[in-house]
């Protein structure tokens, strides 16, 4: 079976939510909080491979772990999977779970799962809680707006 067209080059971005929380890993889970002192070095950059026109793959750790949307029964959850972002293909059906649709609004960006329509990448209002997915982006319970800045 053909593997499908590989995606374009990976770029590193800094991401933080509109409450200024940055991402870091805790027990192999992606968490958002206010890092301080020497812990600021734990901040996870987001590795991005764009897919035309507004979709992208999202990874961390130099693209060695990727964010995906997984449905299991009634549960929809964000998962970190140990796959290489540059091995993903926009044309492979099984890679769709790694794709997110980027929507920009002024200086902020939202990320909707392509495989789980209506589910958005989010953080909790409280610090040091897992990054997750919500299907209620306008309820104000979870934060779905992010600042997304190409890393220098």
């Amino acid at each position: 079976r053909p593997s499908g067209r590989k995606s374009s080059k990976m770029q590193a971005f800094r991401i933080w939510d509109v409450n200024q929380k940055t991402f870091y890993l805790r027990n192999n889970q992606l968490v958002a909080g206010y890092l301080q002192g020497p812990n600021v070095n734990l901040e996870e950059k987001i590795d991005v491979v764009p897919i035309e026109p507004h979709a992208l793959f999202l990874g961390i750790h130099g693209g060695k772990m990727c964010l995906s949307c997984v449905k299991s029964g009634d549960e929809t959850r964000l998962q970190l999977e140990a796959v290489n972002i540059t091995d993903l293909s926009e044309n492979r059906k099984q890679d769709k779970r790694f794709a997110f649709i980027r929507s920009d609004s002024g200086p902020t960006t939202s990320f909707e799962s392509a495989a789980c329509p209506g589910w958005f990448l989010c953080t909790a209002m409280e610090a040091d809680q897992p990054v997750s997915l919500t299907n209620m982006p306008d309820e104000g319970v979870m934060v779905t707006k992010f600042y997304f800045q190409e890393d220098e």
Epitope: N19, Q20, Y34, G37, V40, T108, K145, Q149
Partner: antibody, heavy 119, light 109 residues
């Protein structure tokens, strides 16, 4: 263009409460944070607190027990409330926008409102 | 709470390069303190110049630049102009709060 404008009571008696409103235009409070900063006469700036775009607030720890910051996104207004006022709270009070770049803050400022705490 | 200190006053001449610094009581200033620099002109006119250590705010002339020099944050004005005479404030970020320094009165003679 981006504008912020503070409005306050001017004169407040000691032990009373203060309420200042910052009305913004040219940007959305759902995309940018707003800081409150004050400057006592002849002194430097003192950061009071911030309300981020997502609604979370952070405060100067020395003033936290007396401060409350809130906002109304639809009215483009941010509110500073401060209780148990003392004479050393006499200052110019400013609101300032927090920029969208990471921690790139205080890019636009209001013209300030004078607060005098005196009996 | 951390204490942030700046030079109280500096004097320069038009066309010269001048550097203002910002020191933290907690140790070396790093990029994680996201130093911000704000200019204050008469009649309470404040303008953000630099954010995030070295990001120039929109519309700020290129002669203003931010950096880290040694253990301090720095604002350098390359080719100072008479209109740069003002008070300059720096602010440093400590996890989830900002602390302003004293202030530096810059005279351009």
């Amino acid at each position: 263009q981006v504008q912020l404008k503070e409005s306050g009571p001017g004169l407040v008696a000691p032990s009373q409460s203060l309420s200042i409103t910052c009305t913004v235009s040219g940007f959305s409070l759902t995309s940018y944070g707003v800081h409150w900063v004050r400057q006592p006469p002849g002194k430097g700036l003192e950061w009071l607190g911030v309300i981020w775009a997502g609604g979370v607030t952070h405060y100067n720890s020395a003033l936290m027990s007396r401060l409350n910051i809130s906002k109304d996104n639809s009215q483009s207004q941010v509110f500073l409330k401060m209780n148990s006022l003392r004479t050393d709270d006499t200052a110019m009070y400013y609101c300032a926008r927090g920029g969208a770049l990471l921690r790139s803050h205080f890019d636009y400022w209001g013209q300030g409102t004078t607060l005098t705490v005196s009996s | 709470q951390a204490v942030v200190t700046q030079e109280s006053a500096l004097t320069t001449s038009p066309g010269e390069t001048v550097t203002l610094t910002c020191r933290s009581s907690t140790g070396a200033v790093t990029t994680s303190n996201y130093a911000n620099w704000v200019q204050e002109k008469p009649d309470h006119l404040f303008t953000g110049l630099i954010g995030g250590t070295n990001n120039r705010a929109p519309g700020v002339p290129a002669r203003f630049s931010g950096s880290l020099i040694g253990d301090k944050a720095a604002l350098t004005i390359t080719g100072a102009q008479t209109e740069d005479e003002a008070i300059y404030h720096c602010a440093l970020w400590y996890s989830n709060l900002w602390v302003f320094g004293g202030r530096t009165k810059l005279t351009v003679l």
